[in-house]
């Protein structure tokens, strides 16, 4: 059975294709190739006579065809018009003709695509954006990439127009991209340059830093306000409701107690038209805004019950503070045997009982701050008494 095979079947425009012939009969007068699915003298590409070992170009010969003695046909510099069927007619010595038809498909070498957008500055949670991959070409597959990843499954992402258009419904600030489109056909692939979205959003609720509330008189008050926003927010400050200045940072040197009050940061995005405010209370006081961690010491940590006493001391360098004691999360003193002295810096237990064993800690505090010591463990031992009858008491 005479057959033909296209090598390759899918050909890039400008390249070459070889129509290979299989099972060519032995005793031949010659053969001819025709464009199309049937023998048509007007569409003859080439004829070859065995007797002259010479080929003759036909009316459909473009000068790009080369026939080989084995009847194979090479077509060079193919165009998309060359796509289609080709028929080989073999004239045998017995004057019986045999025919075989093959085909190939010519695809263009794809250009570098580009992305067009209907809105390059969308507003968050409000606008949709449609990206279109250009150019539109036949027999082409369109693919999209976001952040170098294939498209995630999302109800906000829609493909249309044969995947040539990617629509983002209700964009968010995380949709900036980059976005790339890729076009593919059986012979080539090409990817666009990346495109990023400038998503307009915000401002979010501003944050005032630092987070400190308490300041000493004479200190410098330096507050900074930040709200996530695109374009960047415009800031203004109010103190106790009175406008101060339109800056991101507020600086007041050498503050006094009179500078205590509510500090408001106002953030505005002129594009979205949205405003957000945050209020922070500032207290200027002599009191230490941060109380240092106190140290706890014991006259001894292992004592004999009903016999020994123990003194626990809470040490701090801070002034204007108060001290309180805790034992097993309970406030002390909790019995007649416990006494506080020296402004509560010392806790005395006399005598120590079995139930006094456990964890003790102290806490120093002022009206605006407090801090706890590390815990200390008190162990209470009893001298072993001989058992008289092996029965437990009571």
């Amino acid at each position: 059975q005479l057959t033909t095979e296209s090598m390759p079947f899918n050909v890039a425009e400008g390249k070459e294709v070889l129509l290979l012939v299989h099972n060519l009969p032995q005793q031949l007068f010659g053969y001819s190739w025709y464009k199309g699915e049937r023998v048509d003298g007007n569409r003859q590409i080439v004829g070859y006579a065995i007797g002259t070992q010479q080929a003759t170009p036909g009316p459909a010969n473009s000068g790009r065809e080369t026939i080989y003695p084995n009847a194979s046909l090479l077509i060079q510099n193919v165009t998309q018009n060359d796509t289609g069927f080709y028929t080989l007619q073999v004239i045998k010595s017995d004057l019986v003709n045999e025919e075989a038809t093959g085909q190939f498909h010519v695809y263009p070498e794809l250009p570098k695509p580009s992305i067009s957008s209907n809105n390059s500055n969308p507003v968050e949670d409000k606008d949709a954006v449609a990206f279109t991959c250009e150019p539109e070409t036949q027999d082409t597959t369109y693919l999209w990439w976001i952040n170098n990843q294939s498209l995630p499954v999302s109800p906000r992402l829609q493909l249309s127009n044969g995947n040539r258009t990617l629509t983002l419904l209700s964009v968010t600030r995380n949709d900036t991209g980059p976005y790339e489109c890729e076009i593919q056909n059986p012979v080539s692939a090409n990817r666009s340059d990346p495109v990023t979205l400038n998503v307009t959003y915000g401002p979010d609720t501003p944050t005032i830093s630092p987070s400190d509330t308490y300041y000493r008189p004479g200190a410098n008050l330096s507050l900074s306000c930040y709200a996530a926003s695109n374009p960047p927010a415009q800031y203004s400050w109010l103190i106790n409701g009175t406008f101060q200045q339109s800056t991101q940072e507020l600086f007041i040197p050498n503050i006094t107690v009179n500078n205590s009050g509510s500090y408001t940061c106002h953030a505005n995005n002129s594009v979205t038209g949205c405003n957000r405010t945050t209020v922070k209370t500032i207290i200027v006081t002599e009191l230490s805004p941060v109380v240092a961690k106190p140290q706890i010491k014991a006259s001894k940590t292992t004592v004999t019950g009903d016999k020994d006493s123990v003194n626990l001391t809470c040490s701090t360098n801070d002034t204007g503070i108060s001290i309180r004691w805790f034992f097993k999360n309970q406030s002390l003193p909790s019995s007649e045997r416990m006494k506080l002295s020296q402004g509560n810096t010392t806790l005395s237990i006399n005598p120590v009982k079995r139930e006094d064993a456990g964890t003790y800690w102290c806490e120093v505090f002022n009206p605006i701050s407090k801090n706890q010591s590390d815990p200390i463990m008190l162990n209470v031992n009893y001298n072993a008494l001989p058992q008289e009858n092996g029965l437990s008491p009571g």
Epitope: I50, Q54, T56, I67, P69
Partner: antibody
Framework: QVQLVQSGSELKKPGASVKVSCKAS????????MNWVRQAPGQGLQWMGW????????TYAQGFTGRFVFSLDTSVSTAYLQISSLKTEDTAVYYC???????????WGQGTLVTVSS | DIVMTQSPDSLAVSLGERATINCKPS????????????LAWYQQKPGQPPKLLIH???TRESGVPDRFSGSGSGTDFTLTISSLQAEDVAVYYC?????????FGQGTKLEIK
């Protein structure tokens, strides 16, 4: 690459015979016809004829019948030109040239000088 | 039989100048069904075999410098060397392969003036 290599120069006496060989490489000998061309000293090119390398059938141009024989040995990819009863006017360079599939001649052998002198 | 007539028999041209050689077949070598002229041009340098330059009357063989060009149709053909180089000194032959016997022109010897 496609190449035709011919045998070396020959000096013959009138009446003798000569056999010029043309070895083909870089392709299958039987796929393309082989032409023979004569160039007498200081003269132009004269087509002597060709041999169908597929069938072995020779075709001789006018004036090259009788004493001239084209033959093949496909086992060694070689075509031959044999001239018998040599005459002094047979002194020439003899070229083999592959018949391209469309009919022109390409490539050519380097030529074999046959000198017939008493 | 088709007789090929070349003119001139010899030609002297200055380096860098244009050289033109004509060839006239005694009958048309244009095959009407495919509109192809069955004519080739060859270059033969001294001591060398001929080398194919042009086929189908105007199609330059690969590797042939583009200063060589062929033109014409039917019974009137021209080989042109647009800017003669020293290495172009040779004898040039036209040949028809339209019919058997194929035939060559008598040759044109090209020299430098």
């Amino acid at each position: 690459q496609v190449q035709l290599v011919q045998s070396g120069s020959e000096l013959k006496k009138p009446g003798a015979s000569v056999k010029v060989s043309c070895k083909a490489s870089g392709y299958t000998l039987t796929d393309y016809g082989m032409n023979w061309v004569r160039q007498a000293p200081g003269q132009g090119l004269q087509w002597m004829g060709w041999i169908n390398t597929n069938t072995g059938n020779p075709t001789y141009a006018q004036g090259f019948t009788g004493r001239f024989v084209f033959s093949l040995d496909t086992s060694v990819s070689t075509a031959y030109l044999q001239i018998s009863s040599l005459k002094t006017e047979d002194t020439a360079v003899y070229y083999c040239a592959r018949k391209a599939i469309w009919g022109w001649f390409d490539p050519w052998g380097q030529g074999t000088l046959v000198t017939v002198s008493s | 039989d088709i007789v090929m007539t070349q003119s001139p028999d010899s030609l002297a041209v200055s380096l860098g100048e244009r050289a033109t050689i004509n060839c006239k077949p005694s009958q048309s070598v244009l095959y009407r069904s495919n509109n192809k002229n069955y004519l080739a041009w060859y270059q033969q340098k001294p001591g060398q075999p001929p080398k194919l330059l042009i086929h189908w009357a105007s199609t330059r063989e690969s590797g042939v410098p583009d200063r060589f060009s062929g033109s014409g149709s039917g019974t009137d053909f021209t080989l042109t060397i647009s800017s003669l180089q020293a290495e172009d000194v040779a004898v040039y032959y036209c040949q028809q392969y339209y019919s058997t016997p194929c035939s060559f022109g008598q040759g044109t010897k090209l020299e430098i003036k």
